[in-house]
């Protein structure tokens, strides 16, 4: 008669997270006579899944009635799997004997695989600002998914890209993997409000991809504009010049007003108005007592916005030759002439 | 939850015995191969023992082997390292360990510390 | 038997960046038949038992932060914190199941806040 043999069909087994696992296994005679036991690894420090003598095995069922005459299907299902369920599961049989059975011969074993969801896709952008017309690339990272079969799609505003670079790490077979995609968007002034999106879709996910997203607020500057104007005014001997700073991203601001050179007051903006692009807006004015001076005056309105080198602009506010003869009786009001930018 | 709490540690004059006890709770004690590892003070980890799921087979790093002994009481939930003929290089904590499958060790006692010292 | 070391022994890291840990292997803890890495990574905080991080190289184990990662494959492997957390210092094994017994770690890697 021919000796027993283990047989174990399936070389792997793939099974979802929380779902059943069947691993099956046959014998080809009933004898000798002894138990089958189920073992996840091999060795001294080998698991016992299933002893069909005795044991408490709550996550185990036998697929057929063990206890029938004649049976010789050991296959188990187990339940709710779970990454930490990975590994080879060995069908063994054993040998009535006294005081203890003895092993007589183990199956091939049945590698069971998890198939896992990948983490909650991480996106980040450029470590530092860029202005519009320019180009910043975002990275998205997603681990831990398997099998290896993925998609990946970036989005900006709702409308997919196309200029990104996309790698699943291992290369070569593994328990679970990685996903490491680089997009190129190019700025532009109405980016405040934009936001690009990771889209990832993956068998475990059930159709329901997951997303990552990133607020191109982190990524953009808008320099400001600057327009110097002045203003009509009652009194005779004052000018009053405004410096309008307009549409700049982000808040941070400080203004610095220069007479003939030489620095009048510094503020930091405070009170902004927001446009609907995201953008800010805010004035900032300089009273000149133009009785004080005899010579044409040059006011510079300087910015520095969000620490990059300042940018001015500079008007001549022209002294009437009335002022300049007669001082504080001069009536007329100063001139105002533009200049070139500083 | 999985709980293995370690007792029997001391100190101990070179060539005495001492034996090291764990008591699991929170899982199937008699369903894995179970593990001791230890630490010396600064160093880092060192896999002494391990002993199957019924206790019928067992291994030992060869440092220890002839003189460490791993054994289990299953109808107590405790393991045992039973450690003769002591040296100072054993002087470590040592920590009881739960295998997950023949793998990696996903849990672990707070250790006890053993000192041989004359 | 397995000889793994790890590199650096120590790193300091500014909080929030990213911490990467390297594994190596004197021979490869891939098992072909079933491709997969027989390495996991535990985290030892002072004064505690080690916890294990990441098993078969690159699975999480439930609980742990996703900020962390493993890769890798044969005899290279890299232990990955993306961005440095203050609970984060602590010493980091590597240890290999491959070829048992005797079941071998890394020598350590010490991580500390720059």
């Known amino acids: 008669e021919d000796e027993l043999q283990v047989i174990q069909p399936e070389k792997s087994v793939s099974v979802a997270a929380g779902e059943s696992a069947t691993l099956r296994c046959a014998m080809t005679s009933l004898i000798p006579v002894g138990p089958i036991m189920w073992f996840r690894g091999a060795g001294a420090g080998r698991e016992l899944i299933y002893n069909q003598k005795e044991g408490h095995f709550p996550r185990v069922t036998t697929v057929s009635e063990l206890t029938k005459r004649n049976n010789l299907d050991f296959s188990i299902s187990i339940s709710n799997i779970t990454p930490a369920d990975a590994g080879t599961y060995y069908c063994v049989k054993f040998r009535k004997g006294s005081p203890d059975d003895v092993e007589f011969k183990s199956g091939a074993g049945t590698e069971l695989s998890v198939r896992a969801k990948p983490s909650a896709p991480v996106v980040s952008g450029p470590a530092v600002r860029a202005t519009p017309e320019h180009t910043v690339s975002f990275t998205c990272e997603s681990h831990g998914f398997s099998p290896r079969d993925i998609t990946l799609k970036w989005f900006k505003n709702g409308n997919e890209l196309s200029d990104f670079q996309t790698n699943v790490d291992p290369a070569g077979d593994s328990v679970s993997y990685s996903i490491h995609s680089t997009a190129r968007v190019v700025l532009t002034r109405g980016d405040v409000h934009s936001q690009v999106i990771c889209e990832i879709a993956h068998i475990t996910l059930q159709g329901d991809p997951l997303r990552g997203t990133a607020n191109l607020s982190e990524a953009i500057r808008v320099p400001p504009t600057l327009e110097v104007t002045q203003q009509p005014m009652r009194a005779e001997n004052q000018a009053n010049v405004t410096c309008q700073v307009s549409n700049f991203y982000p808040r941070g601001l400080q203004l610095t007003w220069l007479e003939n050179g030489n620095v009048s007051r510094t503020e930091t903006a405070s009170t902004l108005i927001e446009n609907k692009d995201g953008t800010y807006n805010w004035m900032s004015w300089l009273l000149v007592n133009t009785c004080a001076h005899r010579d044409d005056v040059v006011l510079t309105c300087q910015v520095e916005h969000d620490g990059q080198q300042a940018v001015s602009k500079s008007y001549a506010l022209e002294i009437s030759a009335h002022q300049k003869e007669h001082g504080s009786d001069i009536t007329h009001e100063a001139a105002l002439a533009p200049t070139a930018p500083l | 939850q999985v709980q293995l709490v370690e007792s029997g540690g001391g100190v101990v004059q070179p060539g005495r015995s001492l034996r090291l006890s764990c008591v699991a709770s929170g899982f199937i004690f008699s369903n894995y191969g179970m593990h001791w590892v230890r630490q010396a003070p600064g160093k880092g980890l060192e896999w002494v023992a391990v002993i199957s799921y019924d206790g019928r087979n067992e291994d030992h790093v060869d440092s220890v082997k002839g003189r460490f002994t791993i054994s289990r009481d299953n109808s107590k939930n405790t393991l045992y390292l039973q450690m003769n003929s002591l040296r100072a290089e054993d002087t470590a904590v040592y920590y009881c360990a739960k295998g997950s499958g023949s793998y990696y060790f996903d849990y672990w006692g707070q250790g006890t510390l053993v000192t041989v010292s004359s | 038997d397995i000889v793994l070391t790890q590199s650096p022994d120590s790193l300091a890291v500014s909080l929030g960046e990213r911490a990467t840990i390297n594994c190596k292997s004197s021979q490869t803890v891939l098992n072909s038949s079933n491709n997969k890495n027989y390495l996991a990574w535990y985290q030892q905080k002072p004064g505690q038992p080690p916890k294990l991080l990441i098993y078969w190289a690159s699975i999480r184990e439930s609980g742990v932060p996703d900020r962390f990662s493993g890769s890798g494959s044969g005899t290279d492997f890299t232990l990955t914190i993306s961005s440095l957390q203050a609970e984060d210092v602590a010493v980091y094994y590597c240890?290999?199941?491959?070829?048992?017994?005797?079941?071998?770690f890394g020598q350590g890697t010490k991580v500390e806040i720059k």
């Open positions: 240890q290999q199941y491959y070829n048992t017994p005797p079941w071998t």
